[in-house]
Every structure is written in C-alpha cells, then in structure tokens.
C-alpha cells in the first residue's frame, strides 16, 4: 500500500510514457491519474516497469473500478492480468474474442492458471455456448482444454464447433467425455464420404456404439491398433471376428501384441476359438469348440 502524498510540482503525468519508469512508487500513486491510465493502458505494455511499479498501477485501476474493469481496460492488461485474482476476474464481463486472445497470449507457454480458468469460464458462460471460434482459440492455447470440461459442460458444445477439434485435443479425454463428443462429431461430419469421414471421426471413436463400429467395418477403413485400443469395451465385445478383421484390415496382426490388454483381452474371451483361429495369429482364450454360449441378457429380454 502506497502512502497518499501530494504530487511534486511539475511531475503530474500528462500521458503514459517511458518517463514514468523514473517515478518512485509514491510518485506514481500521486502523479498518475487513474482515468488517464485507463485510457492509455495499451502504452503500459510497451514500458519496462518493475513489478512493484505495476502493483501501484493495478491499485489505481482497482480504486477507479471497484465493481470490475471495463473491457476496454481488460483487453490491454498484459502482464497485469497475471496479478488479478479469480475474484477480480469474476467481476468482469468479457465478450470479445480479441480480449480473450490478448490475455491468453500473456500466459502462453505456462500451465492453465486459476486466472485463465476463471477468465475462460466467464467468457464461455457469457457467450452461452462453446462456439467454433472460441473452441479454436482455446484449443490453440491449451490443447487439453476440451478434456478438462465435464460431460455436462461438453453438452453445450454445438456440433459445428467439432470442426475445430484436432486429434491431440482429445488425448486426455476419458470415455465419459467421448460419449458426449462422439454423437456431435458424427452429426458434424455426416455429409463427408467414407474415407474422409473416417479420418475426421477417428479421434472421437472412443465414444462410438457397437452398431457404428459394425457399419465402419463395412467400409474398408483399416483402423489402426491405437484407435482400436481406445474403443469402449462394451462396444467392441459384440463384434464378430470377421467384423474386427474388416475393421482393422492389415492392422489385424497387431491384435497378437495386445491380446492381454483391454478391450482385446475381453473380446477374445467372447469369441469362439474356431473363429479366432481363422485369423492365423495364434490368439488363445476363446470359447472352446463344442461349448454352447447362452446370452442371458437376451433370455431375460424374452421372458
């Protein structure tokens, strides 16, 4: 806290410029008008102030705007954004994507801070949904952003926004998140032809149901093992050996290396050993020949 003292004669700042770095903290407090500072915040970002001097400038803005800064000031906060508390940021009304970008740039290369998380939350809530341009921006700065959202939050993502999602943006998503995103992706890419469709939908397939995997198996997609291993176990189990062979194409040989891991392990246990042998991969653990398999869930449905 800087003591209130009168500004020395001739030192009253007429504009925000480099000469202010020669002001002591108390002089900045006494000689820089808060309203002038607010209108010339963009200049602050070109002046090499010390952190202590910036604290004084922030204090002046806090006094001028106790209910929260206007967007005209927020857009030019630069480093001062990192000095804000989440409580400060909750008072803001940020509507411009340019403002969001400018503040994310300041934090670029760092983990998502509480300030950034709060800013994004305020911005998205203000927009009402996670539109394509916002998603584009957020995933460019934070590739893991999408997977940090709850399934409930993801439900507000319109299918049109899915076009902005890159495969790496989904790396840390869990099955519950992919369950929400997959139907949106299916809708977004529905007008694409087979091979193009598969390229786009591939990253989302961790949320695909059995019937969609069966449909893909009819399209010569040659799914790689990495994608197959991310599929929902419950979606893979009903697939026949022939369907998995068609789904994987030349990659089917990779099943051998994954036979002890889910979902391959669980799928093998559900297949007839005779059928597995047709692959010629030496997969073991299928249902022995001559055994009768009762599907109890089907029996319950009939009774």
């Amino acid at each position: 806290e800087v003591e209130k003292t009168a500004c020395p004669s001739g030192k009253k700042a007429r504009e925000i410029d480099e000469s202010l770095i020669f002001y002591k903290k108390w002089e900045l407090e006494a000689c820089v008008d808060a309203a002038l500072l607010a209108t010339q915040m963009d200049r602050v970002n070109a002046i090499p102030f010390t952190y202590e001097q910036l604290d004084v400038l922030k204090h002046k803005l806090d006094e001028l705007y106790p209910q929260g800064y206007p967007e005209s000031v927020i857009q030019h906060l630069g480093y001062l954004f990192l000095k804000m508390s989440p409580e400060d940021i909750r008072k803001w009304n940020v509507t411009s994507l340019e403002t969001l970008k400018a503040l994310l740039e300041v934090n670029k290369g760092h983990e998502m801070s509480p300030q950034v998380a709060t800013l994004i939350d305020r911005f998205v809530k203000g927009r009402g949904q996670l539109d394509k341009d916002t998603l584009d921006t957020l995933t460019a700065f934070y590739p893991g952003y999408l997977c940090s959202l709850s399934p409930e939050e993801l439900s507000s993502v319109p299918p049109s926004s899915i076009w902005a999602v890159r495969p790496q943006d989904l790396d840390t998503c869990d099955p519950r998140q992919l369950d929400v995103l997959y139907p949106k992706a299916r809708l977004a890419f529905q007008n694409m032809n087979g091979s193009e469709y598969f390229v786009k939908i591939q990253s989302f397939l961790g949320g695909a149901p059995t019937e969609d995997l069966k449909a893909l198996s009819q399209q010569n997609v040659s799914m790689d093992l990495a994608t197959f291993m991310k599929l929902r176990t419950d979606a893979v189990l009903p697939l026949t050996v022939a369907e998995v062979q068609k789904l994987l194409g030349p990659h089917v040989e990779g099943l051998k290396a994954e036979e002890r891991h889910r979902p391959v392990r669980d799928w093998i246990l559900r297949q007839r050993q005779d059928d597995l042998d047709t692959l010629g991969l030496g997969l073991q653990g299928g249902i022995p020949n001559g055994y009768l398999v009762l599907d109890l869930s089907m029996q319950e449905a009939l009774s």
């Epitope: 480099e18 070109a46 002046i47 090499p48 630069g78 480093y79 400018a102 670029k108």
Partner: nanobody, 115 residues
Framework: LQLVESGGGLVQPGGSLRLSCAAS????????IGWFRQAPGKEREGVSS????????NYADSVKGRFTVSRDNAKHTVYLQMNSLKPEDTAVYYC??????????MGQGTSVTVS
C-alpha cells in the same frame, strides 16, 4: 521469464563498468528494457530505458551524460555503460523487460560498489 544481469563489481570513483542484461530461455529482441537500481535501505529507482528497436532511450537526471544504454540484438543482449562513477551509484542494478502482449521479465540483479 527470467533476465540475467552481469558485469557488476567493485570500482573506484571516476571509474567505469559495463553491465549486461541477457535473457534466459527466450530472446530479448522484441523486449523494451529498463535498468533500475536499489541502494541499501532505499527504494528501487529507474536509471534508463531502451526501446525494442534501440531507437529510443531515456535516462534519469542523476545519470544523464554519464550512463549510456544500448543493445546488440545479434547477441540478444542489452548493455548499460557506466562512466564517471560516483559513490552514490553504489547499488544492486536490475534490468526489467516488456515484450509482445505485455509479457514481462526481470532479473535478480548485479551488485555495483563504487569505493
């Protein structure tokens, strides 16, 4: 983001020193740089500044005509040439920088003693 100062030391009154400010883990080229100093028991004060291009420089009244700030963007370094040093120039000298989007960096300081 971290800046690193060097070149401080002990010098006699009337002597000269050249301080350097370099960046650690990033490049200084698009950063405007300010030099500051803090004498024992006193508040940190501004000494000089230089724009990112090097085209604009400023000095505190107390060092005008004695100190010169410059930069060599090929070496990613900013210099403070200090001539005609006086005992009252004794302090820890720091550089601070501001780059694109208001990103900031500051150093830990280098000590200058004029005695």
């Amino acid at each position: 983001l971290q800046l690193v100062e060097s070149g401080g030391g002990l010098v006699q009154p009337g002597g000269s020193l050249r301080l350097s400010c370099a960046a650690s883990g990033f490049t200084l080229d698009n950063y405007a740089i300010g030099w500051f100093r803090q004498a024992p028991g006193k508040e940190r004060e501004g000494v000089s500044s230089i724009s990112s291009s090097g085209g604009s420089t400023n000095y505190a009244d107390s060092v005008k005509g004695r100190f010169t700030v410059s930069r060599d963007n090929a070496k990613h370094t900013v210099y403070l040439q200090m001539n005609s040093l006086k005992p009252e120039d004794t302090a820890v000298y720091y550089c601070a920088g501001v780059g694109n989007y208001g990103r900031r960096a500051m150093g830990q300081g280098t000590s200058v003693t004029v005695s």
